[in-house]
């Protein structure tokens, strides 16, 4: 019978008695930076080339005995998970292993750096097809390791890493905290986050998605036909490396940004029990479990978007938080969130020739998050239109006035400490979908984009009585690009996108009187690209 | 996922003009920074990655490494260049006493220095 983990990542249309999805990643080379491996294991024999690269520290302790099977156990298992004949994800992928971890599974940042450099030099000397680099390791936050990962990613290499097994914020570890790396947390057969001893999988905004990582059957270095169950975020990362190899084999021209967006898009949504995570991390942690796409082609027509959370701003009065999209992505909207509700909104601003999303803390606030909606929109030309505070009773409004530009997101930012205590909120006049409306004391920012075939529409869901959460979702075929709250009153904690749903959070109902100010409206901007759909049909 | 994350210790050693009369002294006002792992048991003091500014060529990296060795020797310290980086990041890996950090941070082209640390199988 098919192991649970392979079943979990396989879309129903592939599921038969045997796990045999089309094309097993044969055009892709996967580099594994790990322990030594047993390359003659029947699972991986002929699939893994052991390079001559080795950079490991001495083993700790005077009584440590090097036992070949122990030295090879981690790397052999992971190689099997990626490309093993019986229990592998991408059975056609070829692999190259570099030894950066010793027999105790310990390495150094410097050894890992030299390994990454080795891969880059190999790539330059002998360019091959798409490259995936699997980093099933973690150390403390390292600026230099993150920088090296960034450089390698910008050279067109897909890096996949373990989130870490420390039951902690993945942003405190490297390479997990590197934005360019695909960071993977671990879940079990019950879609619960994995517990490992007293600890478990890492979580938080630096995790891109989760994958099977508990009780994973794979090649054992005990003998050439042995199997063993191992667990950890390394195993989860190996699944994603395998899925990435499959996707890149089907579409070798995919960029890192496109691959990441597809991984997110085809993941199982909202299946993880979030109660396992610390309360303050639940909103930041993606509820996504990796899966193979249902077919290898035909995803190109979709408008892909993802949500990127910033680091926490900190509590000082003028503190700000910045969320950035990847170089190949467009920032289509910007929102903010504060657990205390004390914030001064958000704005999109240019930084180094690219738009970023900046959120502003307010006096007495515990800090804010900026939330960017980052999308793949080829040939896009986006700009931000700003209207200063109107001071008029009708409130502030701004629209996309350029021909062919459509509204993809609305942001509002205010200087006053407590918006909404002065005047009742204003609501958008109906029939004007291409404009953002906000409080009269706020400046309003409209994200306006022109792209071939791009069309957008506004969808609202209002609740007259106070409610802790109001949501509105885009329908099938449309993608959420913008998420904001109407009105920008003081009891709104903020707005953010979860997959294709716009979520507006308010203060605890018990602390909010059921006045008219209790009314909260979630505003979603839903877009699609007719151009991408046509291009896809022409290809087929 | 950002580079500004919190629990990461940063030690900024401001540059002062000293007796070393460097041929390629850093531009006035720039400060190279020193970083080390926030998790103390994972630190590996005595080995440092010296990262140079982005456009630094391999020959400049080698020259900077040699200059560090020469200046350290003048102070009676032994250093060993373990690796010179090029291809991904310009810089070098050096085994040296932590006493030399202030000196190393003043070298030309230096962007930052990071103390080596452990990574673990997950």
């Amino acid at each position: 019978s098919i192991p649970w983990n392979l079943e979990r990542i396989t879309p129903p249309r592939y599921r038969a008695d045997e796990y045999q999805p089309p094309d097993g990643g044969s055009l892709v080379e996967v580099y594994l930076l790990d322990t030594s491996i047993q390359s003659d294991h029947r699972e991986i024999e002929g699939r893994v080339m052991v390079t001559d690269f080795e950079n490991v520290p001495e083993e700790d302790g005077t009584r440590f005995h090097r036992q070949a099977s122990k030295c090879d156990s981690h790397g052999t298992h992971l190689a099997g998970v990626v490309s093993g004949r019986d229990a592998g994800v991408a059975k056609g992928a070829s692999m190259r292993s570099l030894r950066v971890l010793n027999c105790q599974g310990k390495g150094t940042v410097s050894g890992t750096l030299i390994g990454l450099e080795f891969i880059r030099k190999s790539q330059l000397v002998q360019p091959v097809g798409p490259l995936v680099v699997l980093l099933p390791l973690a150390g403390g936050y390292s600026r230099v390791l993150n920088a090296a990962c960034q450089r390698l990613a910008r050279a067109g290499v897909v890096l996949v890493t373990a989130a870490g097994n420390f039951r902690d914020d993945a942003c405190l570890y490297s390479p997990a905290s590197a934005p360019e790396v695909i960071t993977v947390g671990a879940t079990n057969a019950q879609d619960q986050p994995v517990t490992l001893g007293t600890l478990g999988t890492n979580f938080g905004r630096c995790v891109d998605l989760f994958a099977p990582g508990e009780d994973i059957i794979g090649a054992s270095s005990d003998c050439s036909t042995c199997f063993v169950s191992q667990s950890g975020t390394s195993q989860a990362a190996a699944h994603v490396a395998g899925i990435a190899a499959m996707m890149l084999s089907a579409e070798p021209e995919l960029t890192l940004a496109e691959l990441r967006q597809r991984l997110i898009h085809f993941s199982a949504k909202d299946v993880i029990n979030e109660a396992w995570f610390p309360e303050d991390q639940r909103v930041l942690t993606p509820n996504l479990v990796a899966a193979l796409p249902p077919s290898t082609h035909g995803a190109g027509w979709q408008l892909f978007c993802r949500t990127v959370w910033s680091a926490h701003s900190g509590p000082t009065r003028m503190a700000t938080a910045v969320a950035r999209c990847a170089p190949d992505e467009e920032l289509l909207s910007c929102s903010s969130f504060s657990r205390s509700g004390k914030r001064r909104g958000e704005r999109m601003e240019a930084q180094g020739g690219k738009l970023v999303c900046r959120a502003h803390n307010a006096f007495g606030g515990e800090g804010v998050y900026a939330i960017a909606r980052c999308c793949l929109l080829p040939q896009a030309n986006c700009s931000v239109h700003t209207a200063p505070p109107a001071e008029a009773s009708m409130g502030t409004r701004v629209h996309c006035h350029q021909q062919g530009h459509v509204l993809t997101g609305c942001s509002s930012h205010w200087e006053v400490e407590d918006l909404g205590t002065h005047k009742p909120p204003v609501l958008r006049p109906r029939g004007q979908p291409n404009q953002c409306v906000g409080h009269r004391e706020a400046s309003i920012h409209a994200s306006c984009c022109h792209a071939p075939g791009l069309e957008c529409k506004v969808k609202e869901h209002g609740i007259p009585a106070p409610q802790e959460q109001v949501t509105v979702a885009c329908e099938e075929g449309w993608t959420l690009t913008g998420c904001s709250a109407l009105p920008g009153t003081s009891h709104v904690l903020g707005a953010y996108a979860v997959d294709n749903t716009c979520v507006v959070r308010s203060r605890d109902v018990s602390t909010t009187g059921s006045t008219s100010e209790g009314a909260v409206t979630a505003v979603a901007i839903c877009c699609r690209s007719r151009h991408l759909a046509q291009a896809s049909q022409e290809l087929q | 996922q950002e580079d500004e994350d919190g629990d990461y210790e940063e030690l900024v050693l401001a540059l002062r003009s000293e007796e070393d009369g460097l041929a390629e002294a850093p531009e006035h006002g720039t400060t190279a920074t020193f970083h080390r792992c926030a998790k103390d048991p994972w630190r590996l003091p005595g080995t440092y990655v010296v990262v140079l500014k982005e456009e630094t060529h391999l020959s400049q990296s080698e020259r900077t490494a040699r200059r560090l060795q020469a200046q350290a020797a003048r102070r009676g310290y032994l250093t060993k260049i373990l690796h010179v980086f090029h291809g991904l990041l310009p810089g070098f890996l050096v085994k040296m006493s932590g006493d030399l950090l202030e000196l190393a941070l003043k070298l030309p082209h230096v962007d930052y220095i990071e103390e080596d640390s452990s990574v673990f199988a997950q």
Epitope: N165, I216, D222, T225, C226, F227, S229, S231, G232 | -
Partner: antibody, heavy 130, light 107 residues
Framework: EVQLVESGGGLVQPGGSLRLSCAAS????????MSWVRQAPGKGLEWVAN????????YYVDSVKGRFTISRDIAKNSLYLQMNSLRAEDTAVYYC???????????????????????WGQGTTVTVSS | DIQMTQSPSTLSASVGDRVTITCRAS??????LAWYQQKPGKAPKLLIY???SLESGVPSRFSGSGSGTEFTLTISSLQPDDFATYYC?????????FGQGTKLEIK
Amino acid sequence: EVQLVESGGGLVQPGGSLRLSCAASGITFSSYWMSWVRQAPGKGLEWVANIKQDGSEKYYVDSVKGRFTISRDIAKNSLYLQMNSLRAEDTAVYYCARDRGTYYYQQGSYNYYYYGMDVWGQGTTVTVSS
Amino acid sequence: DIQMTQSPSTLSASVGDRVTITCRASQSISSWLAWYQQKPGKAPKLLIYKASSLESGVPSRFSGSGSGTEFTLTISSLQPDDFATYYCQQYNSYSYTFGQGTKLEIK
């Protein structure tokens, strides 16, 4: 679905020998430790022995040490219990069971996490009597 | 060797009752304890592992707690299918021992 099927039980005289077999299906067999557990008539469960995936480590309850030998054949997906010098008190239903557990790394140490015996055979009866 | 003592040996209860079975270890076993259910003529079935983790497919009315030397299995609302014998089992460096069992019968 993993299935375990025991065979080889029967009536044997004290001092005699018997070899129990347990046939398993799928690669999951070779991925876990395996155990033999017995249950004397009207009594509780008693763990007898277990064996590592590759057969390199074996453990026994004190009462059978030196008399019973656990082994496995990965190629045949089979587990065995060779029982020698049988005594009347060895009379029981013998179950083979899969010891589900997993290995994981944490800061340079390789650890084992045990879940329990999650798959059991239907049992085979051994009667030791003259 | 570690001894496991279950109490009570027999427990009479009715459908809908909340019942608790206790298991004591002769020395600390951390959380390395599993609970099994066995019906006459059948093989045991794993219910709980690592003291409190519910095995896949087991109804949520079953729960486990405890660590060190004292452990409990609780059935929040007895169903007709729950009348059986229950065993605890400790795991300690690859050798195991079971408790003597608790027979849960209809009152």
